[in-house]
Structure formats: C-alpha cells, structure tokens
Amino acid sequence: SCNTATCVTHRLAGLLSRSGGVVKDNFVPTNVGSEAF
C-alpha cells in the first residue's frame, strides 16, 4: 500500500473519522509511520 506522507495523512484522517476521533493524542501524521496501518 501507499506509504507517502500524503497517503499516511489521508489514511489517518479516515481512521480518525471512523473512530469518532477517539485515538491517542499523538496519533498524528508526523508521528505515525506507515507500519501503524
């Protein structure tokens, strides 16, 4: 799967949306690697 910074940002946005934003405070694009997905 795509591991560029932009792909990571969009995947994280989708994850946050599905979880209702209930994730760790530091779960942001610049803190998570592609392995987080």
Epitope: T4, A5, T6, T9, A13, V28, P29, T30, N31
Partner: antibody
C-alpha cells in the same frame, strides 16, 4: 482559521541564494507535513519535496536535490526553503502547502512567493 | 517518475453544461490522485483527494472518479466562476507529480 503566510517577492542575482518562509497558523504545525511546489511562468506544478516539522525529516524530488533545502523552526511554526546557486531557470512562483485534519480536513496552500533571478 | 498526462490542454463549455477533464498516469497509482483548480493569479485550490472524495466546502457539482491509471474530474452545471486550470496530481509514489493542466474556457 488555518493560514500559510509566505514571505514576499524576491529579486536576486544569478549565483546567489534565497530563503523563502512559510508561517503556519490556526493548526498544530508539528502535526502535518509541509510540501513545497514550484510553478514556472505559464507552466504546471512541480513538487520539490516535503518536510516533517516534528523531526525535520525530508523527502526531496531528485531534480531539486542540491538546489533546495527544506527546514523548519518549530518555535515560530515556520517552514523554510533555501534555494542556492540560482539561475534564470529558478525564476518561478513557489508555494508551501499542507494537508491538515484538525481543525479542518483540507489541503491548504500559501499565497505563493515570486522569485525573479536576474542580473 | 510517474507521468500524469492531461491530453486536453483546453476545453470549452457553456454555463449549465457538464464537462469531464481526464488524466492518465504512466503507472498504476491506485486511488491516490488529487485534483486542483487554479484560477488566474491565484494559488491552487484543492477539490478532490483519493480520486473521488470532495474536500469540505467543495460543491457537489465536482465529482472525481477512476483508479489505477485513468482518472476523471466531472463538473456538472458549469458556472462562470469555473473558468480555471484543472490539474491532477498523483501522491502514490515519490516524487509526487502533477499533470500539465486543462484550461476550462466558458463560451
């Protein structure tokens, strides 16, 4: 309100260097990557690279390696792009851009900085 | 590098019409394509990400479709303010690359 405010137009001589700034406001600067894009007159867009403001990590377009250096100052929420050994080919509008998720999910661009390289 | 080809440099349409702007990638980029609108003298403005998702505030007249190598931005009920360049971008691979743009002209 999310904003990316870029520094003003630059007129520089061939061979010189220039440092363009992009000050972010309205969101947590260190949470999102900052991209830099070149638009030569009448042409489309070229991606220069991105920087992770959290740790300073960068990805560069091979074409701009040795030409552009991307840095950040976390304390002022400002991203910088330095361009060196300037030639007329570097005359263009340069944009910073960042995709944020919070407070709003959007792809924001700065207003652009016009660089003119001329003797 | 991935080449993004927008074969139509100019397109002419009338207010109220429907127009489709196409973009072709030189390799499979999955759904990882964005579309931008750039009005004369302005910064690009994001319209679509992940090939088919509209950013907040983008009118539903703008619809993106496609995956792999072939992508389309469709503008329904064209308005006079849609006079602009429409540019695709792939972000599946580094370096990100942009299409050459399609200039939409209003008759």
């Amino acid at each position: 309100e999310v904003q990316l405010q870029q520094s003003g137009p630059e007129l520089v001589k061939p061979g010189a260097s220039v440092k363009i700034s992009c000050k972010a406001s309205g969101y947590t600067f260190t949470d999102y990557y900052m991209n830099w894009v070149k638009q030569s007159h009448g042409k489309s867009l070229e991606w220069i690279g991105d920087v992770n403001p959290n740790n300073g990590g960068t990805h560069y377009n091979q074409k701009f390696k040795g030409k552009a250096t991307l840095t950040v100052d976390k304390s002022s929420s400002t991203a910088y792009m330095e361009l060196r050994s300037l030639t007329s080919e570097d005359s263009a509008v340069y944009y910073c851009a960042s995709i944020t998720i919070v407070p709003v999910y959007f792809d924001f661009w700065g207003q652009g900085t016009t660089l003119t390289v001329s003797s | 590098d991935i080449v993004m080809t927008q074969s139509q440099k100019f397109m002419s349409t009338s207010v109220g019409d429907r127009v489709s702007v196409t973009c072709k990638a030189s390799q499979n980029v999955g759904p990882n394509v964005a579309w931008y609108r750039q009005k004369p003298g302005q910064s690009p403005k994001a319209l679509i990400y992940s090939a088919s998702y509209r950013y907040s505030g983008v009118p539903d007249r703008f619809t993106g479709s496609g995956s792999g190598t072939d992508f389309t931005l469709t503008i329904s009920n064209v308005q006079s303010e849609d006079l602009a360049d429409y540019i695709c971008q792939q972000y599946n691979y580094y370096p990100y690359t942009f299409g050459g743009g399609t200039k939409l002209e209003i008759k």
